[in-house]
């Protein structure tokens, strides 16, 4: 069989949720391998995922160093086998990714309702503060630690017996809402960063309803 040319990567795409960040690209390699490099605008190009036949590279460890920085990645195509390099002067082909700013662009993961507690006609709903892979002083920060007051949660709640939804908002991880005595309610929450222009909202959490295990009911 004759030689083929190395081909440049294309469709470079950032996939990121709660700062877990993977660069994906095409095509599946034939007689070639890839090495990824990542850099900030002012930094060095650091090689990662050396000589791989994968079409993805986990860059989480790099972007969590400073989630407010803007990153650029590039994917090099290296001949491996019966191929010819099509780069000029022996230079390998590469393709640049779009820029990526984790703080502004990482998707907000689906939140989880940690608990709810009814005391009379008040219900306290608590959203789990999910751990991220962002570190400070060797400990992993939560989503709230990273985003602070930029992150709000919207609570959707409704009587089990009806479909009319009400909403509440909080810039903490807790809601305190008024309910009708003797009624069971269902809850769902959504994470939101209002200041963003893209990826502003998470998907809704799984629905939790009173009268099930998660909650606690106290008649005062």
């Amino acid at each position: 069989s004759g030689t083929t040319n190395t081909v440049a990567a294309y469709n470079l795409t950032w996939k990121s949720t709660n700062f877990k960040t993977i660069l994906e690209w095409e095509p599946k390699p034939v007689n070639q391998v890839y090495t990824v490099q990542i850099s900030t605008k002012s930094g060095d190009w650091k090689s990662k995922c050396f000589y791989t036949t994968d079409t993805e590279c986990d860059l989480t460890d790099e972007i969590v160093k400073d989630v407010k920085q803007t990153y650029l990645a590039r994917v090099f195509s290296y001949p491996a086998g019966n191929v010819e390099s099509t780069g000029s002067a022996g230079e390998p082909l590469y393709e640049n990714s779009p820029e990526f700013t984790p703080y502004l662009e990482t998707n907000l993961g689906q939140p989880t309702i940690q608990s709810f507690e009814q005391v009379g006609t008040k219900v306290n709903v608590t959203v789990e503060d999910e751990r991220t892979l962002v570190r400070r002083n060797n400990t992993f920060l939560s989503l709230r630690d990273v985003f602070g007051k930029d992150l709000i949660y919207t609570l959707y709640y409704w009587k089990s017996s009806s479909s009319g939804k009400k909403t509440a908002k909080t810039n903490t991880n807790e809601f305190l809402i008024d309910v009708d005595k003797g009624e069971n309610y269902c809850f769902s929450v959504q994470a939101v960063i209002p200041s963003r222009t893209v990826n502003r909202k998470s998907t809704d959490s799984p629905v939790e309803c009173m009268g099930q295990e998660k909650g606690e009911f106290r008649e005062i």
Epitope: P29, V33, P79
Partner: antibody, heavy 117, light 106 residues
Framework: EVQLVQSGAEVKKPGESLKISCKGS????????MNWVRQMPGKGLEWMGM????????RLNQKFKDQATLSVDKSISTAYLQWSSLKASDTAMYYC??????????WGQGTTVTVSS | DIQLTQSPSSLSASVGDRVTITCSAS?????MNWYQQKPGKSPKIWIY???NLASGVPSRFSGSGSGTDFTLTISSLQPEDFATYYC?????????FGGGTKVEIK
């Protein structure tokens, strides 16, 4: 011109500590991973690991994890390989080599380490 | 770890002979390099990415293979080719070298 210049030959006793160096010049030292390779007398090459000078991230061959430590001093463009307690079995030639693709290939001249009582 | 087994470990050949060195990997490898080392010298990259000749390497050298079996071939051995040749895989960490093949003059 890219150059990697390693420190001179060392003769040590078992149990002693040692730090050998590899100074890079003619390129952006912080931009390239630096490999370390061991060659015991009359034997083949063994990849020990590598370090990225900009942030000191290391990828270490687990075979060497309790034996040697990689470090860098960015301010003087120098990579180091060190031992806290040498053994006779550490007697070898040690090479540093810049991690490069393809025909680019830069190795230090090697440092001979002899450990003998 | 991926083990690389080179064979033969040494060979004696004459100038003009065709020489083949094999490197067998314990699991599949997608990126293989070959190095040449002469006594008292640092190794030099000789073939990279399975079949690409490094700069200045004569065309009598060639590399081939895939999966677990790789070869370095010298079509017509020359005096300057007498050296030790090592394969190295860079497909998975830790990167590993073969044990080497010493090519000697018959």
């Amino acid at each position: 011109e890219v150059q990697l210049v390693q420190s001179g030959a060392e003769v040590k006793k078992p149990g002693e500590s040692l730090k050998i160096s590899c100074k890079g010049s003619g390129y952006s030292f912080t931009s390239y991973w630096m490999n370390w390779v061991r060659q015991m007398p009359g034997k083949g090459l063994e990849w020990m690991g590598m370090i990225y000078p900009a942030d000191s991230e290391t990828r270490l061959n687990q075979k060497f994890k309790d034996q040697a430590t990689l470090s860098v001093d960015k301010s003087i463009s120098t990579a180091y390989l060190q031992w806290s307690s040498l053994k006779a079995s550490d007697t070898a030639m040690y090479y540093c080599a810049r991690e490069d693709y393809g025909s680019s290939d830069y190795w230090g001249q090697g440092t001979t380490v002899t450990v003998s009582s | 770890d991926i083990q690389l087994t080179q064979s033969p470990s040494s060979l004696s050949a004459s100038v003009g002979d065709r020489v083949t060195i094999t490197c067998s990997a314990s699991s599949s490898v997608s990126y293989m390099n070959w190095y040449q080392q002469k006594p008292g010298k640092s190794p030099k990259i000789w073939i990279y990415g399975i079949s690409n000749l490094a700069s200045g390497v004569p065309s009598r050298f060639s590399g081939s293979g895939s999966g677990t079996d790789f070869t370095l071939t010298i079509s017509s051995l020359q005096p300057e080719d007498f050296a030790t040749y090592y394969c190295q895989q860079k497909s998975s960490f830790p990167w590993t070298f073969g044990g080497g093949t010493k090519v000697e003059i018959k």
